[in-house]
């Protein structure tokens, strides 16, 4: 029969024959022959391969370096890489999470729209009219101005995006 020019899924072409790829978690030791299957071996400790492959070496698991603020979120297996995340109060600088930076705080006049996670920074938003923030914080949202009316008081000093309104007693009408 004619030697194949293409192979099925999970196979590869070598020396005019189709050999099975090694399954995830295993590396190639020797190609198949006319008589025998592909020779594969499992990846060693701290190694992985996440696809059907013909790699002769497994990849090393990622190291979550505590000196860079990293910790293990999910331990790697022979088929998956280790997933790193950042220590509390820090977040990854990239999708690959190779290092961490401190969560940013929202300045006065801005509130937290979305609290930071291990992989995303704090998202701040300007306090709209009727709201304020007078602190620099990674957690605090914009607070609504105090409603003087509900306390039977009147506004003595208008609020800003950084300050609350100041309420005072109503002027008594003299008889």
């Amino acid at each position: 029969p004619e030697p194949p020019t293409a192979c099925r899924e999970k196979q590869y072409l070598i020396n005019s024959q189709c050999c099975s790829l090694c399954q995830p978690g295993q590396k190639l030791v020797s190609d198949c022959t006319e008589f025998t299957e592909t020779e594969c071996l499992p990846c060693g400790e701290s190694e992985f391969l996440d696809t059907w492959n013909r790699e002769t070496h497994c990849h090393q698991h990622k190291y979550c370096d505590p000196n860079l603020g990293l910790r293990v979120q999910q331990k790697g297996t022979s088929e998956t890489d280790t997933i790193c995340t950042c220590e509390e109060g820090w977040h990854c600088t990239s999708e690959a999470c190779e290092s961490c930076v401190l969560h940013r705080s929202c300045s006065p006049g801005f509130g937290v729209k979305q609290i930071a996670t291990g992989v995303s920074d704090t998202i701040c938003e300007p306090c709209p009219v009727g709201f304020f923030s007078n602190v620099s914080s990674a957690f605090e949202k914009c607070h609504p101005w105090t409603s003087c009316e509900t306390k039977d008081l009147v506004v003595q000093q208008a609020g800003t995006n950084k300050t609350d309104v100041v309420c005072g007693p109503q002027d008594r009408l003299r008889a």
Partner: antibody, heavy 117, light 112 residues
Framework: EVQLEESGGGLVQPGGSLRLSCAAS????????MSWVRQAPGKGPEWVVT?????????YYASWAKGRFTISKDTSKTTLYLQMNSLRAEDTATYFC?????????WGQGTLVTVSS | DIVMTQSPSSLSASVGDRVTITCQAS??????LSWYQQKPGQAPKLLIY???TLPSGVPSRFSGSGSGTDFTLTISSLQPEDFATYYC??????????????FGQGTKVVIK
Amino acid sequence: EVQLEESGGGLVQPGGSLRLSCAASGFSFSSNAMSWVRQAPGKGPEWVVTIYAGSSGSTYYASWAKGRFTISKDTSKTTLYLQMNSLRAEDTATYFCARGATYLTLWGQGTLVTVSS
Amino acid sequence: DIVMTQSPSSLSASVGDRVTITCQASQSISNYLSWYQQKPGQAPKLLIYRASTLPSGVPSRFSGSGSGTDFTLTISSLQPEDFATYYCQGYYYSGTTYDSTAFGQGTKVVIK
């Protein structure tokens, strides 16, 4: 044709050195582990060393072979080598190269090494 | 290094007999066990690999079984061309820094 052919054997004095070669043909040399196995006259096969596939193939030696024997390969020449130093009478054997590691799918015809004074 | 202990060292049998050879590894080797047949003046020939897989072209009268430390080669009905010496080969895979392989001492199958 898929084959392995050893060469370089012969008579050597105790303490001497010898380099065996194994020429591979008919298959992809770079993606196959290769092993050396020896067989003393009238005895069973004895594993010597294995070199894994890939450019920086890791090597594993039988404990008795460490330090005296060295495996290497030249992918461009599709040739496997076994450098043997400080040879002793008990190293007298037919030396085979074979394709594979956990199982040996293809063997050469062997080359005889005789260590004698 | 791993040690493979094969038994018996020799056996005499007749054509048509069922023959069983055993092999024991000094430590668990999963299913990394192969069997070879060798005839005088020839290199060993792979007969079974991964404990129980037959290479294509090897007659189905040969079979292998076992896992861990204990393995068996069976020839269901001995044929004239089967008179030879049989060797097991165990491969110890550490997954870290050191792998080793070893052969059994052999079983010579002779005509009764």
